[in-house]
């Protein structure tokens, strides 16, 4: 996708719908590209990205990529079309409303990626599959 500061004029007159026939509209996502992160050994983290962008295309979803190597930890937040691979991986969880991190095999680093389809869902990245934000105790942890 194109970052907000260099977005081009696009006009796709086709109405984009999901599998249930619901209209898809450009999503709101955190979009800070790659930033250094302090997120480590936690069940969930906030992105600490202050930029919320309207994605360029209605079919795009929010993506977060967490990477750790010997030197640093980074978190990448973007919009991306799930029909296209990202970092050579398919966005298999793009329909999820939450960004549930899945580990991917990358030599020389620990690499987690998630994608999701609710507004700004890549702001809260979740590493524990059992994690459920309907649990009020966990909500207190996140939003304090």
């Amino acid at each position: 996708t194109i970052p907000p500061h260099v977005q081009k004029s696009v006009n796709n007159d086709m109405i984009v719908t999901d599998n249930n026939g619901a209209v898809k509209f450009p999503q709101l996502c955190k979009f800070c590209d790659v930033r250094f992160s302090t997120c480590d050994n936690q069940k969930s983290c906030m992105s600490n990205c202050s930029i919320t962008s309207i994605c360029e295309k209605p079919q795009e979803v929010c993506v977060a990529v967490w990477r750790k190597n010997d030197e640093n930890i980074t978190l990448e937040t973007v919009c991306h079309d799930p029909k296209l691979p990202y970092h050579d991986f398919i966005l298999e969880d793009a329909a999820s409303p939450k960004c549930i991190m899945k580990e991917k095999k990358k030599p020389g680093e620990t690499f987690f990626m998630c994608s999701c389809s609710s507004d700004e869902c890549n702001d809260n990245i979740i590493f524990s599959e059992e994690y459920n934000t309907s649990n009020p105790d966990l909500l207190l942890v996140i939003f304090q």
């Epitope: 907000p4 500061h5 260099v6 977005q7 081009k8 004029s9 999901d18 619901a22 209209v23 898809k24 509209f25 450009p26 999503q27 709101l28 919320t52 962008s53 309207i54 360029e56 409303p97 939450k98 389809s117 609710s118 507004d119 700004e120 869902c121 702001d123 809260n124 934000t133 909500l139 996140i142 939003f143």
Partner: antibody
Framework: QVQLVESGGGLVEPGGSLRLSCAAS????????MSWVRQAPGKGLEWVGR??????????EFAAPVKGRFTISRDDSKNTLYLQMNSLKTEDTAVYYC???????WGQGTLVTVSS | DIQMTQSPSSLSASVGDRVTITCRAS??????LNWYQQKPGKAPKLLIY???SLQSGVPSRFSGSGSGTDFTLTISSLQPEDFATYYC?????????FGQGTKVEIK
Amino acid sequence: QVQLVESGGGLVEPGGSLRLSCAASGFTFANAWMSWVRQAPGKGLEWVGRIKTTYSGGATEFAAPVKGRFTISRDDSKNTLYLQMNSLKTEDTAVYYCTLDLRTYWGQGTLVTVSS
Amino acid sequence: DIQMTQSPSSLSASVGDRVTITCRASQSISSYLNWYQQKPGKAPKLLIYAASSLQSGVPSRFSGSGSGTDFTLTISSLQPEDFATYYCQQSYSTPPTFGQGTKVEIK
């Protein structure tokens, strides 16, 4: 297609309360930030407030003139957005629009008149 | 709050004219600017988002440009259905704020 239909507007005395509803259809309501925007007669557009998705805690934000008097809630099971307006003032008189936050879909608006 | 100032507040133009409306932000908003069109008694309609991205279904005679504090909405060849009021809105920070509007009238 996407539809946003507001209801609940009407005439109310200063200091009174009113609850507006917005019934949404044609899109995945639970995934979307929603906003209320108002327009006083013959005036420009004024953002009232927003509610984020339940997935991210359903946080709300408000414009300064309504903060502490208005609340926004959502019922994702009913695809409905609400605006609870308390301690209404004459300057709250306006057409109130329900909108898909920062994007193209708006309701037709419902008129709220605050007058004695 | 970020103040948005539109100019002119109104203009008269003829069908076929090229029309330019400007919007200035009180501080830099990067490209976080939307343009809306509103006709009397109707809800606003989004034309342009992210300063230059044309909303689906909007005719290509509408275009947007600018970044930072200065933005422009251009209608390359005014059509009868374009006579309306146009608003800019910043989405850079909360609260999102609108310009006061520019009314485009028939000359």
